[in-house]
Interface confidence: low
Amino acid sequence: RAPRCRDLPVQKWWHTGALYRIGDLQGFQGNGAGNLAGLKGHLDYLSSLKVKGLVLGPIHKNQKDDVAGTDLLQIDPNFGSKEDFASLLQSAKKKSIRIILDLTPNYQGENSWFSTQVDTVATKVKDALEFWLQAGVDGFQVRDIENLKDASSFLAEWQNITKGFSEDRLLIAGTNSSDLQQILSLLESNKDLLLTSSYLSNSSFTGEHTKSLVTQYLNATGNRWCSWSLSQAGLLTSFLPAQLLRLYQLMLFTLPGTPVFSYGDEIGLEAAAVPGQPVEAPVMLWDESSFPFISAAGSANMTVKGQSEDPGSLLSLFRRLSDQRSKERSLLHGDFHALSSGPGFFSYIRHWDQNERFLVVLNFGDVGLSAGLQASDLPASASLPAKADLLLSTQPGRDEGSPLELERLKLEPHEGLLLRFPYVA
């Protein structure tokens, strides 16, 4: 008799794929535009990325550092009207893209939560949650919560409002902290909270260190649903050595949890991070006309248009990974097991019941390596076969679909492999 199938876990929409942050409408749209009506025109692009949610804004009225002049129920006229927003919600729904609204109050000012009048601000947030839930928003984000006094209790309260309206609504909190204890204390009192932090960017970017960061986090959070990013708002290129960009895309898409990206991550967009100054939003490079004041000769390989036409580009890799992440059970909600690995690399298995299994091998080193994968730590339900088929490599030139011997895997510097193998009873 065939073994009984494992019961499927409850899957919320944010469990099924990546979230995409557009914190700056002007930067994202470029060409001097930057409003909700214009954003509607880019929903097809977001669909092509197979992202499940768009984290938008903040777009509310905020007079810099002025509590009275901050209205979380009003859209800043520079971005458009409530009608424009309703129209965006409707169009996004048709394309199965959920809208998450950033309500970080004082986003134009010095302290995101104002330095005083915490209770007044918290009440404004409560009112805003109720208002925008009625308007059809799918979730909310609040950032810089390390600046919010009694953050845990406020988050619990806001979570109750959100979940009370519908279990299908999401609350994301962002912090600049990379400290695991601080992160855990925020998560402790908030069961379904999705938390973005700088945890992964506090790294020496070796295979060994990354493995220990990931496994510590997963062990500490238990069966709680995680999110994976390198920061609460910035671009991957601001935190990573450039040569590890593809490797991290592969990792973020294949760890158990929701990957969260910022606009431009899919093409390797860069933005200067200047000490002591707010990061100015970079302009999204749609095509060569996005370079308004310099000659853009040879720049196509940096743009969405140029990368869309190149199967070996970062954007093409992003799309392939996002597609796999949203349809394979083992990647959607499978168990995670890290394999024994050397200092240069990190590898793990994702598996769910009798579905196809996935093996991820990441070489963080700047030298090629031969990896003999050790399955010693694996439970019987996740044993390694002798060979697995190569689904994709982060580097061009591999023969995809071909079986690779796991005892004798050779990886190029900074190469990541995604391999698949069947369940065997």
């Epitope: 290129t237 450039a242 860069e270 200067a272 200047v274 970079p282 302009v283 308004p292 940096m302």
Partner: nanobody
Framework: QVHLVESGGGLVQAGGSLRLSCAAS????????MGWFRQAPGKEREFVGT????????YYTDSVKGRFTISRDNAKNTVYLEMNSLKPEDTAVYFC??????????????????WGQGTQVTVSS
């Protein structure tokens, strides 16, 4: 404050090569987009090329594409302009510049915050 100093200019025959350096002090430039510009006598300053923060992306004006190469060594806080197959029309004062707000000179805000004093390049026929 960022202080930029160019060096490596000089007199060279047409077809020859030069390597200009731009050494920065006062702050690390690894998070700045860096650009090279030039100004020929009696002409406006013109864009030559730019390099992104990490050095992974470069852009050049059409007239130098394929002949000039910009690179950077963030550990040494220095940016380079390698110039090959030089032509008399490349004669100019060459300036390097730092954009502290952007990783490339590509955003609509544009503009560089810090400039060097320039180094003279003369190409004789």
């Amino acid at each position: 404050q960022v202080h930029l100093v160019e060096s490596g200019g000089g007199l060279v025959q047409a077809g020859g090569s030069l390597r200009l350096s731009c050494a920065a002090s006062g702050r690390t430039i690894s998070t700045y987009g860096m650009g090279w510009f030039r100004q020929a006598p009696g002409k406006e300053r013109e864009f030559v090329g730019t390099i992104s923060c990490s050095g992974t992306s470069t852009y050049y004006t059409d007239s130098v594409k394929g002949r000039f190469t910009i690179s950077r060594d963030n550990a040494k806080n220095t940016v380079y302009l390698e110039m090959n197959s030089l032509k008399p029309e490349d004669t100019a004062v060459y300036f390097c510049a730092a954009d502290t707000r952007h990783c490339m000179g590509y955003t609509k805000h544009g503009g560089y915050d810090y400039w060097g004093q320039g180094t003279q390049v003369t190409v004789s026929s």
